[in-house]
């Protein structure tokens, strides 16, 4: 059974992941730029199911495409450095799901925009944090 300290660590990591995803979404929502329209044409794969930490495998597999889309947004008004940001998210995801996982991600048939993708993973983090609180 998970100890209280391991639960606390998991909760903190999930909170960090949640904040990072919220920061990206906020940056995109604040973005007044023709590039935004182009960003929204990129399609992301969504998990068929995302209810457990092992399902973060699905997020991990989409981090490279996410970085590529965020690279489009570089400007003086977009304050997220994609490489640092994705690297930070990747570290958190690996710690949360465990690097030895053999879980194979199953994706939904429908793809999503970056906004829908981020909202899905934000909801995932929030729901798991709620069960830990």
């Amino acid at each position: 059974a998970p100890t209280s300290s391991s639960t606390k660590k998991t909760q903190l990591q999930l909170e960090h992941l949640l904040l990072d995803l919220q920061m990206i979404l906020n940056g995109i929502n604040n973005y007044k730029n023709p590039k935004l329209t182009r960003m929204l044409t990129f399609k992301f794969y969504m998990p068929k199911k995302a209810t457990e930490l092992k399902h973060l495998q699905c997020l991990e597999e989409e981090l490279k495409p996410l970085e590529e889309v965020l690279n489009l947004a570089q400007s003086k008004n977009f304050h997220l450095r994609p490489r640092d940001l994705i690297s930070n998210i990747n570290v958190i995801v690996l710690e949360l799901k465990g690097s030895e996982t053999t879980f194979m991600c199953e994706y939904a048939d429908e793809t999503a925009t970056i906004v829908e993708f981020l909202n899905r993973w934000i909801t995932f983090c929030q729901s798991i944090i709620s069960t830990l609180t």
């Epitope: 909170e15 920061m23 304050h79 450095r81 940001l85 934000i122 709620s130």
Partner: antibody, heavy 113, light 107 residues
């Protein structure tokens, strides 16, 4: 003990910039993301933005975008909030808060000609 | 942005009274709501997080409830040190937003 200590009060002229510091102690600096909140005299609380202290990236409220810059110095466990093109409406107490649980004492910034 | 509306904006009460403050979000925020107490010249102090969890060291006379869009902060028996301004705050989505505050004054 866990605490955030902010720099002292500032008086600035319209059009100038102000840089407020917030030094963390008593905990691992990179453990909690840092928010900045301001409060105009007799008014409510207003969120300005957030900084990830480990990686240094930021996200700002739309209202402040283009005027605010948040930075950090991990060697001194300090975060900074710089607000430029000051106007009288920016007169407020500026707070840093670590994970919403710990708050700095506040820094009064007065903008007056 | 999510708007947070508190009511009442001020209230007068006596020591020992039961006080209730409500907060309404413009859209569902699940239980991503916190309550703060602020005294003049001081920084806000976290009382309740996740809508109903009491922060460490906060007296048990404070309680929070609600989920979705409607939330309540209750002080079961008002003490002299409880006269202050109270704010609700949502952290469900950025930008983080606060209610306009409720000032609890001595009757």
């Amino acid at each position: 003990q866990v605490q955030l200590v902010q720099s002292g009060a500032e008086v600035k002229k319209p059009g100038a910039s102000v840089k407020v510091s917030c030094k963390a102690s008593g905990y691992t600096f990179t453990r909690y993301y840092m928010h900045w909140v301001r409060q105009a005299p007799g008014q409510g609380l207003e969120w300005m933005g957030i900084i990830n202290p480990r990686a240094g990236y930021t996200s700002y409220a739309l209202k402040f975008q283009g005027r605010v810059t948040m930075t950090r110095d991990t060697s001194t466990s300090t975060v900074y909030m710089e607000l430029s093109s000051l106007r009288s409406e920016d007169t407020a107490v500026y707070y840093c808060t670590s994970g919403w649980e710990v708050w700095g004492q506040g820094t009064l910034v007065t903008v007056s000609s | 942005d999510i708007q947070m509306t508190q009511s009442p904006s001020s209230l007068s009460a006596s020591v020992g009274d039961r006080v209730t403050i409500t907060c309404r979000a413009s859209q569902s925020i699940s239980t991503w709501l916190a309550w703060y107490q602020q005294k003049p010249g001081k920084a806000p102090k976290l009382l309740i997080y996740a809508a109903s969890s009491l922060d460490e060291g906060v007296p048990s006379r404070f309680s929070g409830s609600g989920s979705g869009t409607d939330f309540t902060l209750t002080i079961s028996s008002l003490q002299p040190e409880d006269f202050a301004t109270y704010y609700c705050q949502q952290s469900y989505s950025f930008p983080v937003t606060f209610g306009q505050g409720t000032k609890v004054e001595i009757k």
